[in-house]
Each structure stands twice: as C-alpha cells, then as structure tokens.
C-alpha cells in the first residue's frame, strides 16, 4: 500500500549530511523499516520481540541509524548531487497483526548550501 508523500519533515540537514526520518506508530511493536532510494534498498532495520519481551534489532543492509519508540532515522553523509532522488520509508508491520506494508516518501533536493559543513 502506498500512502504517498510524507506529511512531515522527512529530511533534516546537518554538517554536510542528512537525517532521513521514518515515522511509525508507537503501538507497533515488531516491524521492518527499509529506506529506499528510488527502487533500491539502501538501509534495512528489523525490530522483533522474543520471549520475555527481549528486543532484537537486526540490519541486513546496514546504515547508521537511530531507533526510537516511534521513528527510525537513517543518516547519509558526504552529500553530493547524486544523492538527489526520491527516498521512501518502507514499513512492514508484524505486530500488531494484521501484517501491513506502508510506503511514504519525498524528494531529496540537494542545494549547494547543504553540501559542505552547513548546519540547517
């Protein structure tokens, strides 16, 4: 299911890099979040819960990422013009059931001011 454009600020620029914010509802306990650049999987983070509510975080395609109870942030560094593209947060929800897949995204514009050491 494609939900379309993110209705929040998805890209946060700092120090020549960008933080891409992928939100999810805090009720979601087990999920996979992928960051897609166009159709290519750049990053992959899976959160599962085992017995005794032990949390497991796995990444098949590793990126510098940060997990909170309602978002996953992926960080891209050393921005250049080739980074300009459509980026999508592809969320697969395992718990609570039923299984759901949602895709939200936006276009990352690269401006000269964001390429080198700019804090925005």
């Amino acid at each position: 299911e494609i939900n379309g454009s993110a209705n929040y600020e998805m890209f946060i620029f700092h120090n020549g890099g960008v933080q891409i914010l992928c939100k999810y509802p805090d009720i979601v306990q087990q999920f996979k979040m992928q960051l897609l650049k166009g159709g290519q999987i750049l990053c992959d983070l899976t959160k599962t819960k085992g017995s005794g509510n032990t949390v497991s975080i796995k990444s098949l395609k590793f990126c510098h990422s940060q997990l909170s109870n309602n978002s996953v942030s992926f960080f891209l560094y050393n921005l250049d013009h080739s980074h300009a593209n459509y980026y999508f947060c592809n969320l697969s929800i395992f718990d609570p059931p039923p299984f759901k897949v949602t895709l939200t995204g936006g276009y990352l514009h690269i401006y000269e001011s964001q390429l080198c050491c700019q804090l925005k």
């Epitope: 299911e1 939900n3 509802p25 929800i93 039923p98």
Partner: antibody, heavy 125, light 109 residues
C-alpha cells in the same frame, strides 16, 4: 453501493466439505482486510478467519487446520474452504470488511463496517 | 488469549432512559482496536463504535463509547425504540487476532 453477498451455504454431512464465497462490490476490495464471522442459532458472534491485504491469514484454534480463507482481488471475491466439518460448525456465516490505516505516527482500525446478509451452513447427518 | 466479558447479560430499560453497557477484557486492549456492534433479530451486525470512542458513519450522537485498558463502556444517552437489540464488543490486533464478547441484550422494560 457498497455490498457484500455471501453464497455457498447448505446442508453437509459431518466430515464433509463446503466452500463459501463472498462477492464484494462498490469499493476497492484489495485495500481492505476481509473476515468471516459466524453465529449459531441463538448464540453470539464468533470470529472464524481473517485475510489481510497482503494475503496473510489468521484463524482461531477452533477452525485452524480445517478452514482456509483466500481472496481473489481481480474478481473482488473472498472464499472460505471448510473441511472436516462438525455439527458445531452449524451457523450463519457472514463476511465482513475492515480497514487498518497506518500513516506516520497514526494507526487506526475502523472496525468491521460492512457485512453481508449471511449464508447458512448446516452440518448434520 | 484475550477474552471479552460483557455485562450485564440482559438490560431491561424503557425508552428515554440511559443505557450503560460494559465490556471487560482479560488483558489490556489498545483502545485503537476496540469496537462495538448492534445486532437486531434476523439482521447482520452493524458497526456502532470503532477505536473505543469513534462513531461509525450514520450512527446517531446518542451512542458513545469510552474506556481504555481492560474496561470499556458503550452508552446510549436516551433510548429510542429502535435501540433495543443485542450489543457486542470486539477486540482486534491481539491474540487471537479477533474476538467478540458474548453480547448484552437490551430489552424493553
């Protein structure tokens, strides 16, 4: 008009099989979770099965291994294959739809908002 | 497994009175996944309330839902003759995926 119409009910002997169908119209079938719920005469509602938008399936212990839910989005159709039927499976079988919407921080379940009129299944020798 | 217990089993009231129906879960249920249905004899159930408190399309304002955790309530502020029916609560998104309460019959006193 949004509508669900069940068919395929009837009289079957214990141990027999039956396939129920539910024809959907008036909405985008593929974007909804679909359910079978049954009700024995004079009794309450009992959840039988659910199929998600990705084809994922769910059953209670009472029917697991005997019943199979499936969907054919191209035909706007929902099915319930019932095998090894027992007298306790005798009931009116309803199909129903529901939607779960996830967007950003929001997660909303909108309930089973459309139901069919039901089809009667009788298991008896 | 989450079990929903509704009370009372039967509620006898007169038109114009206020009805309060209870649904108690054996373990915590997210309010997102709690719904209420009305069923009249010979008819399919009708969705009244979703998300514990959201009124479904076309449902009169006299119907309201509340609660969280394990205790949920359906209130009918002023009973109309057509409100006498059986009411079911339902949970979703847990184990099992879906379950219904046993129902409360609202009858005319």
């Amino acid at each position: 008009e949004v509508q669900l119409v069940e068919s395929g009910g009837g009289l079957v002997q214990p141990g027999g099989s039956l396939r129920l169908s539910c024809a959907a119209s008036g909405f985008t079938f593929s974007t909804y979770e679909m359910h079978w719920v049954r009700q024995a005469t004079g009794k309450g509602l009992e959840w039988v099965s659910t199929i998600g938008t990705a084809g994922d399936t769910y059953y209670p212990g009472s029917v697991k291994g005997r019943f199979t839910i499936s969907r054919e989005n191209a035909k706007n159709s929902l099915y319930l294959q019932m095998n090894s039927l027992r007298a306790g499976d005798t009931a009116i079988y309803y199909c129903a739809r529901s939607s779960t919407v996830v967007s950003g921080y929001r997660y909303d379940y909108y309930g089973m908002d459309v139901w069919g009129q039901g089809t009667t299944v009788t298991v008896s020798s | 497994e989450i079990v929903l217990t509704q009370s009372p089993g039967t509620l006898s009231l007169s038109p114009g009175e206020r009805a309060t129906l209870s649904c108690r879960a054996s373990q915590s249920v997210s309010s997102i996944f709690l719904a209420w249905y009305q069923q009249k004899p010979g008819q399919a159930p009708r969705l009244l309330i979703y998300g514990a408190s959201g009124r479904a399309t076309g449902i009169p304002a006299r119907f309201s839902g509340s609660g969280s955790g394990t205790d949920f309530t359906l209130t009918i502020s002023r009973l109309e003759p057509e409100d006498f029916a059986v009411y079911y609560c339902q949970q979703y998104g847990s184990s099992p995926l879906c379950s219904f309460g046993q129902g409360t019959k609202l009858e005319i006193k």
